[in-house]
């Protein structure tokens, strides 16, 4: 008799989810040396332990930390660049500013980055057919937690300036939404965070508007402000001669506004 | 390669005012941070405040927080890197360097400064 299984709202999991979680360990633990002591199939095994045979409604950053204990990255703390809806240009970013690191750049961001899991509550199986939806589901999935839980501890570690990268062409650039308005800004240190400069990256070429004075910015400036900490923002009106300067800083055409 | 030549230094009494400059030339960018040290006769060389390539992105020593202001001026190619020390202290006597850095992230480490001037000399008298 075929078992009655539970219709979420989301897609299911990542095809090939296991063999994808333990070859972009074995991949990342290669690149980069000073993870080369972490052992992959461990590293599965407590990624999987945080959501198989859970109800997937009802997952705890708790669940996440033997994985979070074995994922430990010591990042630059003065290197860090956060962003909000506006990933692919942040991880083009990192890889041109190599000592710069956006979460994705951390092993459990690398290992975790456009995958969806989750299981069932009492069964060792995989859910492939569906997920629960953050909104139309549920906010404890183990996805959400997942992602809630390493933003939380990246903010955390963070220090001296931290960059965000932001949408300009979004409607609410600043979204108290968003992991970054709703996790990052909140768990940002004050006693080791001086500034917070937000990097607001129009999207088109006749747009010269001052973005920073958009309302959600003031906004974010009135947060960060309130948590002692400094803010500063800065439009990027052309991002693809911004990520050209970066790579080429001495370029005659990097003086001038981008 | 880049020249960076500092100016302002000298003289003052404690409780006083001083502006630093550092005029940064040769191929230098405004998308290179820009950072002031200091050394104390007898000390290692330390940070004391940069400023990334926007202009926005401030950094701070502890020692000199809420007491000196950082800024600089990309303006006509012109890379200009200032400094304002108010309420000086004779702790402040050092000789003050301005250092550069390809990239844009703020660092107070000595070691990622790619480039620095001779340096002007600060003497703070009681």
């Known amino acids: 008799v075929p078992r009655w299984r539970q219709q979420w709202s989301g897609p299911g999991t990542t095809k090939r989810f296991p063999e994808t979680v333990l070859a972009r360990c074995v991949k990342y633990t290669e690149i980069h040396p000073e993870m080369r002591h972490v052992d992959c199939q461990s590293v599965w095994d407590a990624f999987k332990g945080a959501f198989i045979s859970k109800h997937p409604c009802n997952i705890t950053e708790e669940d996440y930390q033997p994985l979070m204990k074995l994922g430990t990255q010591t990042v630059p703390c003065n290197k860090i660049l956060l962003w909000s809806r506006i990933k692919d240009l942040a991880h083009q970013f990192t890889q041109v500013q190599r000592d710069m690191f956006t979460l994705e750049d951390t092993l459990l961001g690398y290992l975790a980055d456009d995958l969806t899991w989750c299981g069932e509550f009492n069964t060792s199986k995989i859910n492939y057919q569906s997920c629960p939806d953050w909104r139309k589901d549920c906010s404890n999935n183990p996805v959400s937690v997942f992602w809630k839980t390493v933003s939380r501890r990246f903010a955390e570690a963070a220090c001296d300036v931290v960059h965000v990268m932001l949408n300009g062409s979004r409607s609410k650039i600043f979204d108290k939404n968003s992991t970054f308005g709703s996790v990052e800004v909140h768990n940002l240190q004050p006693e080791k965070v001086q500034t917070l400069e937000a990097w607001v990256i129009h999207g088109g070429r006749e747009d010269s508007r001052d973005l920073c004075q958009d309302p959600t910015i003031k906004e974010l400036e009135s947060i960060i402000s309130k948590r002692n900490i400094q803010f500063s923002c800065k439009n990027i009106y052309r991002p693809d001669k911004f990520l050209q300067c970066v790579k080429n800083p001495e370029d005659s055409s990097c003086t001038s506004e981008i | 390669e880049v020249q960076l030549l500092e100016s302002g230094g000298g003289l003052v009494q404690a409780g006083d005012s001083l502006r630093l400059s550092c005029v940064a030339s040769?191929?230098?960018?405004?998308?290179?941070?820009m950072a002031w040290f200091r050394q104390a006769p007898g000390k290692e060389r330390e940070f004391v405040a940069s400023?990334?390539?926007?202009?926005?992105?401030?950094?701070?020593a502890d020692s000199v927080k809420g007491r000196s202001t950082i800024s600089r001026d990309n303006a006509n190619a012109k890379n200009m890197l200032y400094l304002q020390v108010d309420r000086l202290k004779v702790e402040d006597t050092a000789v003050y360097y301005c250092?550069?850095?390809?990239?844009?992230?703020?660092?107070?480490?000595?070691?990622?400064?790619?480039?620095w001037g001779q340096g002007t000399q600060v003497t703070v008298s009681s």
């Open positions: 250092a550069t850095r390809r990239g844009v992230s703020s660092s107070r480490l000595v070691s990622e400064y790619d480039y």
């Open positions: 040769g191929r230098t960018s405004s998308f290179y941070t």
């Open positions: 400023v990334g390539w926007s202009g926005g992105s401030t950094l701070y």
